[in-house]
């Protein structure tokens, strides 16, 4: 079943390559288990950036060696992506799945355009 | 008389606070004197950033204390804005006026959203 997911249109990564945004879903029921996946779309290619699963009220557990961290609060997930470089500029899509209890719900946001600027190297200290 | 002006939707300033974009106008005739003005729109406030007048085939002349520089080539103006900081993020609108010979033409672009990220300060050298 479809579910609405909202996320900001544009976010700027910091000069340290860190970008944060909120992914909010309109939960149709009382889900106790939620799965969040961040997808990156660039040049019509979609790749998975990171994924997390959590019990509502608990911390997000990111899977594998993730470049993402996050916290949850109600129907909001606060996502932070680290280690970004200029070449990582692209559309970052938030996908939310309500896994338990049935019925299963799936929602996909319109994406957040993350802009990343590589910093100038600091001058060598003499 | 109205004239079409095209400019990119989004531009990222470099980590040095420099942003460049092209402003292109569809010249209905052979103008010899052109005036280009860059306006910044933020929070429904519109302010002038810089302005230049040039004779076609010649260099753009910005005022000495201007944060803008630029070159012209045919119906294109290559604009560079320097000294930008994060607080300068906003919509930069290109306004082109064909001043001479008559008739006078005016064109205003849809604006280029310039994003600026302040760099991290370099560590002090010991």
């Amino acid at each position: 079943k479809a579910m609405h997911v909202a996320q900001p249109a544009v976010v700027l990564a910091s000069s340290r390559g860190i970008a944060s945004f909120v992914c909010e879903y309109a939960s149709p029921g009382k889900a106790t288990e939620v799965r969040v996946t961040v997808l990156r779309q660039a040049d019509s290619q979609v790749t998975e950036v990171c994924a997390a699963t959590y019990m509502t009220g608990n911390e997000l557990t990111f899977l594998d060696d993730s470049i993402c961290t996050g916290t949850s609060s109600g129907n909001q997930v606060n996502l932070t992506i680290q280690g970004l470089r200029a070449m990582d500029t692209g559309l970052y899509i938030c996908k939310v799945e309500l896994m338990y209890p049935p019925p299963y719900y799936l929602g996909i946001g319109n994406g957040t355009q993350i802009y990343v600027i590589d910093p100038e190297p600091c001058p060598d200290s003499d | 008389k109205a004239m079409h002006v095209a400019q990119p939707a989004v531009v990222l300033a470099s980590s040095r606070g420099i942003a460049s974009f092209v402003c292109e106008y569809a010249s209905p005739g052979k103008a010899t004197e052109v005036r280009v003005t860059v306006l910044r729109q933020a929070d429904s406030q519109v302010t002038e950033v810089c302005a230049a007048t040039y004779m076609t085939g010649n260099e753009l002349t910005f005022l000495d204390d201007s944060i803008c520089t630029g070159t012209s080539s045919g119906n294109q103006v290559n604009l560079t804005i320097q000294g930008l900081r994060a607080m300068d993020t906003g919509l930069y609108i290109c306004k082109v006026e064909l001043m001479y010979p008559p008739p006078y033409y005016l064109g205003i672009g849809n604006g280029t959203q310039i994003y600026v990220i302040d760099p991290e300060p370099c560590p002090d050298s010991d």
Partner: antibody
Framework: QVKLQESGAELVRPGASVTLSCKAS????????MHWMKQTPVHGLEWIGV????????TYNQKFKGKATLTADKSSSTAYMEFLSLTSEDSAVYYC????????????????WGQGTSVTVSS | DIVMTQTTASLSASVGETVTITCRAS??????LAWYQQKQGRSPQLLVY???TLGDGVPSRFSGSGSGTQYSLKINSLQPEDFGSYYC?????????FGGGTKLEIK
Amino acid sequence: QVKLQESGAELVRPGASVTLSCKASGYTFTDYEMHWMKQTPVHGLEWIGVIDPETGGITYNQKFKGKATLTADKSSSTAYMEFLSLTSEDSAVYYCTRRGARATVYNYVMDYWGQGTSVTVSS
Amino acid sequence: DIVMTQTTASLSASVGETVTITCRASENIHNYLAWYQQKQGRSPQLLVYNAKTLGDGVPSRFSGSGSGTQYSLKINSLQPEDFGSYYCQHFWSTPWTFGGGTKLEIK
């Protein structure tokens, strides 16, 4: 011990419907999801859908939406699957299975299966 | 839908040998994978879940491994009762699809 007892084999005519049952014992019926599977030599094992007996919440595999209807009766600890408008493609062995842990992150598994019900669609 | 591929449809081995059965997912399933054994005319039995956790009562000669899209089931020192069909199943996004199965036969 945990047991899922499925109803007996069925021989049905094309166009008819059939209802399969799965009686659970040895655990609290409403504490676990009940899933249904289809197995054929051609398509192998396929997940049909799941029902939460506690809430009645259901998720179907899109492929079986409109074909299968899942229900559960808490009073008799029995799950049911009605299969509609049968064709020869629906001839298969159907299993009910229990998901092993109720809402435990990172613990998805079908830990107990019924013995299976063979359905043959033939005129 | 996520496609689960078991490239080896059948495999012959002798008692005492070690065999490895593989399963590939069409996208990252983050270890949300189970392995089942099925003997002729019987229902599937759980062997491994979470890609590498043995089910209750499953002999230690069975082991699961893998991550991302590539997973495998290893059986050390094959016993006569190990012959049958083996299926992988993912639990990432619904529908929770199965691999086509690998039939392990006695050589």
